[in-house]
């Protein structure tokens, strides 16, 4: 039978009564466009939705945009359009919600043709009511905020200025012309690239890296030879271009720009990119695209400083810049990983890291699953799973894999079981560890989301027809129960619940078509009536996260640790609540070989966990900047992974090595610096 | 192979506290919950708590919370069970017996490892 | 707490007898079920766990199954040493027993 069908199934008690008196339909009273919806602030319950309604005529196009604010978690919806002047606001924008739960809000309106700038509304009272601005120029990107303090604003104009307000939107000033792109750092700090002459396309790979520390007052130069920039963790990296020729190279500073190493990465051509996967206080991934239209890479991982990488995986599936790539954080365990490989017959195989890119392997099969038609041998195969890429190709996959950090282990994705990626009808998979084990949770293809931190997983299934069903889980995806949330079917859009699976609201978004119109509806279902008491102590049961084989010493070590979770037993049936916190308990682990990677100039041979140098490193300067000047390079060869917190056991101590290097990097080193004031 | 031996035989006034220890060899300790479960005289097989050494990660059923401490020490491989204020009705054989593991919980597998028991009589 | 109760409390069969005791949960417990043999003045012994995985070195006439709230322990064909008390054990809730099934010859 398929998966939850069984009678077996633990049934939630008089759930349909409980669901249909917590469940509210809103009617919009306008024609079928767009929509878009933000949630503003955090537990708030607010939801501003944006509908847009454009008719192209033959010389320009009529639009009409409507405003509607929720505070009650989609149950209720008011039109707010007066509040904003029924202006038409410009939906490529989106709704620019401000940090944190600061309460802001701000819209960017169509203006029209002749105008000197552009027209904002601002809110800083989570959409209750709005001040319309208008701007000294017509903006290029949405407004950013600053992390630190959501009244500093930056924006990009469509001349190239950047502008910057420290009243949230009330006053502006251009501190910069001639900015190709720009970014809030830490501190209020803000980078921009800059071109001297040509334009950001013509100057691409000579335009220099500024900083300002004070919001326009002094700038610094901390880099000449920019093709891009980009921030990740505590890392500013930087592409440099080489002097002798068109390749460019990755240096890394974690000090704001100040000094600068060079990233020991390979330097790539004028048709390849780098690309940072991802990144924390500890390490980046970085993918190094392969030479010509291979549509693959090379992922490596960092050390600590952004400066040592070590080779992570080949042949990783990366289509074009700013293309496609599966890769995904499983947020819900630490050091889990999962992306997609191009394998040499061109077919696509999902691999997944459980210790943050150190080794990689192919998902486990799914008990009781058969193998697809891509496998060679029907008994022997994995699971692969369906991301970006497939759903960028119109494959039937409606959602990305999902996980959340505060429903541990949980992670729900699309798949197929077989040598590489299906172009079949996927079904829906999930993972209660971290993606050790997988079981199939759903036949074909759904969208899904979770609530509750894990307490309910909803779904609902993708199809060209309208549907009025939605089905739910309190037990991880083991069992399922179908609700009609209304008589009356609607094709469906969207589901929305508040980011952060905290919620027990889930919003059902779609349309109902009628002989001459369509009207967008929302159905919101609150689930607290089912989960009807607090969870207990009795709930929760003990879990040891990354266990394969408890009669290893160290089993569930990772980086140096294991972790001790507190998780919901999949019996109980009840509500972890919006308060809810993740309870851990961490343990340090011995440390052995696998705990440190190979400094600059070592290696480690394959099937084997010990550095040793590089063969044709010895006695030759190295082509590696180590904060922009020359110096001596000491190392014993070892150095511990980022984040690993092993303690005692195996300590590689040895005979340090002095490399005398040789800078032949041609960035900025500080003396080189200059600064300015305006 | 593991094996789970426990202390010997005690008798002990009502009131009184008695403390049973389990210690275990030939096999990782600290990687599986130890349960202690008794056995009243001619009845079932009554569970009343189990722990986690690593972490010591201790919980009770509902009847002996307050009155039962499970602790464990993972340098020697010993886990205890200390029960107070005992009555006549305590008299039983108790059990520690390790949790079976497959994946990374600790209490779903079942008991696959017991200590020989060790028999605790109360009377005045 | 979860309550498990287990059925027949006494049953008299002869060897080369298929045997089946039950056991029912109070509550859903999907497939955390154990099952165990008892001997007089011996500690209990690990048949079943997973309410149908049999435990290394159990005999392979031992079979359970079942899943929820419903299980069952089946001795395909009864051996001498297979006269002592069984009893289910679930590990969803707080771990509880059933009341045990005692098999005695017939």
């Known amino acids: 039978s398929a998966p939850g069908e069984d009678e077996e199934c633990g049934r939630v008690r008089d759930f349909v009564a409980k669901l249909a008196n917590n469940t509210h339909q809103h009617v919009f009273d306008d024609l079928r466009g767009s929509v878009s919806l933000s949630w503003v602030g955090d537990s708030t319950g607010v939801i501003l939705v944006l509908t847009t309604f454009h008719v192209p005529l033959v010389i320009m196009t009529f639009g009409q945009s409507k405003l509607y604010r929720s505070e009650d978690y989609g149950k209720n919806f008011k039109d707010i359009t007066d509040l904003i002047n029924n202006t038409f606001i410009r939906t490529e924008f989106g709704m620019a919600i401000g940090p944190e739960n600061s309460g802001k809000v701000v819209l960017t309106a169509e203006v029209s043709g002749g105008s000197r700038g552009g027209r904002i509304f601002r809110s800083s009272d989570f959409a209750k009511n709005f001040v319309q601005t208008d701007l000294p120029f017509h903006p290029l990107t949405q407004m950013m905020y600053s992390p630190q303090n959501s009244d500093y604003l930056l924006a990009l104009s469509t001349e190239n200025g950047l502008w910057v307000s420290k009243n949230f939107g009330g006053k502006w000033e251009e501190i910069h012309k001639a900015v190709c792109l720009a970014k809030w750092g830490s501190d209020n700090t803000i980078f921009f690239t800059t071109y001297a002459n040509g334009s950001c396309k013509a100057d691409l790979g000579a335009l220099e890296l500024w900083r300002t520390s004070d919001l326009g007052k002094s700038f610094k130069t901390i880099g000449v030879k920019i093709y891009s920039f980009g921030l990740g963790g505590r890392f500013l990296f930087a592409s440099v271009m080489a002097d002798k020729d068109t390749t460019r190279r990755i240096h890394v500073s974690t000090d704001q720009g100040d000094t600068w190493s060079m990233a020991q990465l390979p330097s790539v051509g004028q048709e390849q990119f780098y690309s940072i996967l991802a990144a924390n206080d500890d390490m980046v991934f970085m993918h190094v695209d392969e030479p010509g239209d291979t549509g693959f890479g090379t992922i490596f991982t960092s050390d600590d400083r952004g400066i040592v990488y070590s080779k992570s995986l080949d042949r990783h599936l990366y289509t074009t810049t700013g293309g496609e790539t599966d890769f995904t954080n499983v947020t819900s365990l630490r050091g889990v990983y999962i992306t997609s490989v191009l394998s040499e017959d061109n077919s696509i195989q999902t691999m997944i890291t459980f210790d943050q890119g150190g080794r990689w392997t192919h998902l486990r099969k799914p008990e009781n699953s058969e193998c697809d038609a891509t496998a060679k041998n029907k008994n022997e195969c994995s699971l692969h799973i369906h991301a970006s890429y497939s759903i960028s190709q119109k494959l039937n996959v409606p959602m990305a894999p999902l996980s959340e950090p505060n429903a541990v282990g949980i992670v729900i994705a699309h798949g197929s079981v077989g040598d590489a990626i299906s172009v079949m009808v996927p079904d829906v998979y999930i993972s209660d560890d971290g993606g050790y084990s997988w079981t199939k949770m759903l036949e074909g293809p759904h969208y899904y989301t979770i609530l509750d931190s894990g307490g309910i997983i909803v779904a609902i299934e993708h199809s060209s027809r309208p549907i009025n069903v939605i089905k739910f889980s309190t037990d991880e995806g083991q069992c399922w129960q179908t609700y009609t949330f209304t008589r009356d079917p609607i094709y469906f859009t969207g589901l929305a619940s508040e980011p952060g699976a905290r919620s027990m609201n889930i919003s059902i978004w779609g349309f109902t078509e009628s002989f001459l119109t369509s009207q967008w509806v929302s159905y919101t279902i609150d689930f607290k009536d089912i989960l009807e008491r607090n969870c207990e102590e009795k709930d929760y049961t003990i879990w040891l996260a990354h266990s394969t084989d408890p009669a290893d010493y160290e089993d569930g070590c990772i980086l140096g640790y294991k972790e001790q979770f507190l998780r919901l037993r999949k019996s109980s049936v009840c509500q972890n609540g919006r308060d809810y916190v993740v309870t851990k308990q961490p343990s340090i682990c011995l440390c052995s070989l696998e705990d440190f990677l190979c400094d600059f100039g070592y290696y480690r041979p394959e099937n084997d966990s010990k550095c040793v140098e590089q063969p044709e490193l010895k006695g030759h300067d190295l082509e590696f900047c180590l904060y922009g000047r020359e110096e001596h390079l000491t190392t014993n060869g070892y150095r511990k992974i980022p984040g690993d917190k092993c303690q005692g056991g195996v300590n590689p101590v040895r005979e340090v090595k002095d490399l005398k290097k040789k800078c032949t990097s041609n960035f900025l080193s500080p003396e080189k610096q200059n600064s300015k004031s305006n | 192979q593991v094996q789970l031996v426990q202390s010997g035989a005690e008798v002990k006034k009502p009131g009184s506290s008695v403390k049973v220890s389990c210690k275990a060899s030939?096999?990782?300790?600290?990687?599986?919950?130890i349960s202690w479960v008794r056995q009243a005289p001619g009845q079932g097989l009554e569970w009343m708590g189990g722990?986690?050494?690593?972490?010591?990660?201790?919980n009770y059923a509902q009847k002996f919370q307050g009155r039962v401490t499970i602790t464990a020490d993972e340098s020697t491989s010993t886990a205890y069970m200390e029960l107070s204020s005992l009555r006549s009705e305590d008299t039983a054989v108790y059990y520690c017996?390790?949790?079976?593991?497959?994946?990374?919980?600790?209490?779903?597998?079942?008991?696959?490892?017991w200590g020989q028991g060790t028999t605790v009589t109360v009377s005045s | 707490d979860i309550q498990m109760t287990q059925s027949p409390s006494t049953l008299s069969a002869s060897v080369g007898d298929r045997v089946t005791i039950t056991c029912r949960a109070s509550?859903?417990?999907?497939?955390?079920l154990a099952w165990y043999q008892q001997k007089p003045g011996k500690a209990p012994k690990l048949l079943i766990y997973?309410?149908?995985s049999l435990e290394s070195g159990v005999p392979s006439r031992f079979s359970g199954s079942g899943s929820g709230t419903e299980f069952t322990l089946t001795i395909s064909s009864l051996q001498p040493d297979d006269f002592a008390t069984y009893y289910c054990?679930?590990?969803?809730?707080?771990?509880?027993f059933g009341g045990g099934t005692k098999v005695e010859i017939k």
């Open positions: 722990i986690i050494p690593i972490g010591g990660w201790a």
């Open positions: 017996a390790r949790q079976g593991r497959k994946t990374g919980y600790y209490y779903y597998y079942g008991m696959d490892v």
């Open positions: 509550q859903s417990i999907s497939s955390w």
């Open positions: 030939g096999g990782t300790f600290r990687n599986y919950a």
């Open positions: 997973k309410a149908s």
């Open positions: 054990q679930q590990a969803d809730g707080h771990i509880t």
